[in-house]
Interface confidence: medium
């Protein structure tokens, strides 16, 4: 069977006026997954995103991440899109005073 990923979005200051947003998917099986940042609903180009390898996490499941740099104040335009085993979900960038957003996808 399949195990749905836990998706976690974080933000960190990159440079003045910019922030780096990172979307992490963990504890999923099988290893095939789509994880990408979207702006206004459409996927960003590959060259504006950085991906981590899909790695085993030691529990028979996998983990990966994708990050991109965006302008501070435009967070609401960006979402992390995840597709795994025929299911998909969308995850927002947390507001500045809340650095974590967890969602276990069912």
């Amino acid at each position: 069977g399949s195990v749905p990923p836990m998706v976690n979005v974080t933000r960190s200051e990159a440079s003045e006026g910019n922030i780096t947003v990172t979307c992490r998917a963990s504890s999923f099986y099988p290893r095939n997954i789509t994880l990408t940042w979207r702006q206004d609903g459409v996927s960003l180009s590959h060259d504006t995103q950085q991906w981590g390898d899909v790695l085993p996490d030691g529990n028979g499941t996998y983990q990966t991440w994708v990050a991109t740099r965006i302008c501070q104040g435009e967070e609401q335009r960006f979402t992390c899109y995840m597709e795994h085993s025929g299911n998909h979900s969308t995850h927002p960038v947390p507001s500045g005073n809340s650095h974590h957003h967890h969602h276990h996808h069912h």
């Epitope: 206004d40 960003l44 504006t48 969308t90």
Partner: antibody, heavy 122, light 112 residues
Framework: QGQMQQSGAELVKPGASVKLSCKTS????????ISWLKQKPGQSLEWIAW????????SYNQKFTAKAQLTVDTSSSTAYMQFSSLTTEDSAIYYC???????????????WGQGTLVTVSA | DVLMTQTPLSLPVSLGDQASLSCRSS???????????LEWYLQKPGQSPKLLIY???NRFSGVPDRFSGSGSGTDFTLKISRVEAEDLGVYYC?????????FGGGTKVEIK
């Protein structure tokens, strides 16, 4: 493709607010981006803002930031736009429209409501 | 804001004619993801607009193949190979690449 049913015509006084609704059916509401657009009689269209029903995230045309507020009620699959401090310049037909990022990977206003006529008059 | 300019304002045609509508953007409308989100809509009197073409040249579902879109950068064209009565109305081009998304002023296709 689903349905988008907008609320009926409104006659409102200057300075008042109005809340328009767009009730959807036939598709998974929370997967969708809904935009609102304005069209004055005999004129072109203006995009006001979008809302992503899954998260409530929004993006506004700066021109309408102080005027419009978009919300959704996922339990009834309905999108709302509240328009405030109305003037005669706000008299127009307002449309809701659904984006189609899944089926065609990038069509903005694929499916439209029938429009709501708002008339601002003393 | 990206200004979308459509010409002509009015296009008188005879049924069966080919019609060519032009749309020019004030700046390049390639999205940061590499796609060009240029769309064409038709609005008939008393109706909501309907999507015809998305991403410059892709016909939306149910749109007849007499409609075709082309162009790149800042210059775009919608062609109707043989105008039928149901094609009459106002055509709007639209760019969804740069916020705020903007429409052209429209071209009215009417009987000559």
């Amino acid at each position: 493709q689903g349905q988008m049913q907008q609320s009926g015509a409104e006659l409102v006084k200057p300075g008042a607010s109005v809340k328009l609704s767009c009730k959807t059916s036939g598709f998974t509401f929370s997967d969708n981006y809904i935009s609102w657009l304005k069209q004055k009689p005999g004129q072109s269209l203006e995009w006001i803002a979008w809302i992503y029903a899954g998260t409530g995230g929004t993006s506004y045309n700066q021109k309408f930031t102080a005027k419009a507020q978009l919300t959704v009620d996922t339990s009834s699959s309905t999108a709302y736009m509240q328009f405030s401090s109305l003037t005669t310049e706000d008299s127009a037909i307002y449309y809701c429209a659904r984006h189609d990022y899944y089926g065609t990977s990038g069509a903005w206003f694929a499916y439209w409501g029938q429009g709501t006529l708002v008339t601002v008059s003393a | 804001d990206v200004l979308m300019t459509q010409t002509p304002l009015s296009l008188p045609v005879s049924l069966g004619d080919q019609a060519s509508l032009s749309c020019r953007s004030s700046q390049n409308i390639v999205h940061i993801n590499g796609n060009t989100y240029l769309e064409w809509y038709l609005q008939k009197p008393g109706q909501s607009p309907k999507l015809l073409i998305y991403k410059v040249s892709n016909r939306f579902s149910g749109v007849p193949d007499r409609f075709s879109g082309s162009g790149s950068g800042t210059d775009f064209t919608l062609k109707i190979s043989r105008v039928e009565a149901e094609d009459l109305g106002v055509y709007y081009c639209f760019q969804g690449s740069h916020v705020p998304w903007t429409f052209g002023g429209g071209t009215k296709v009417e009987i000559k």
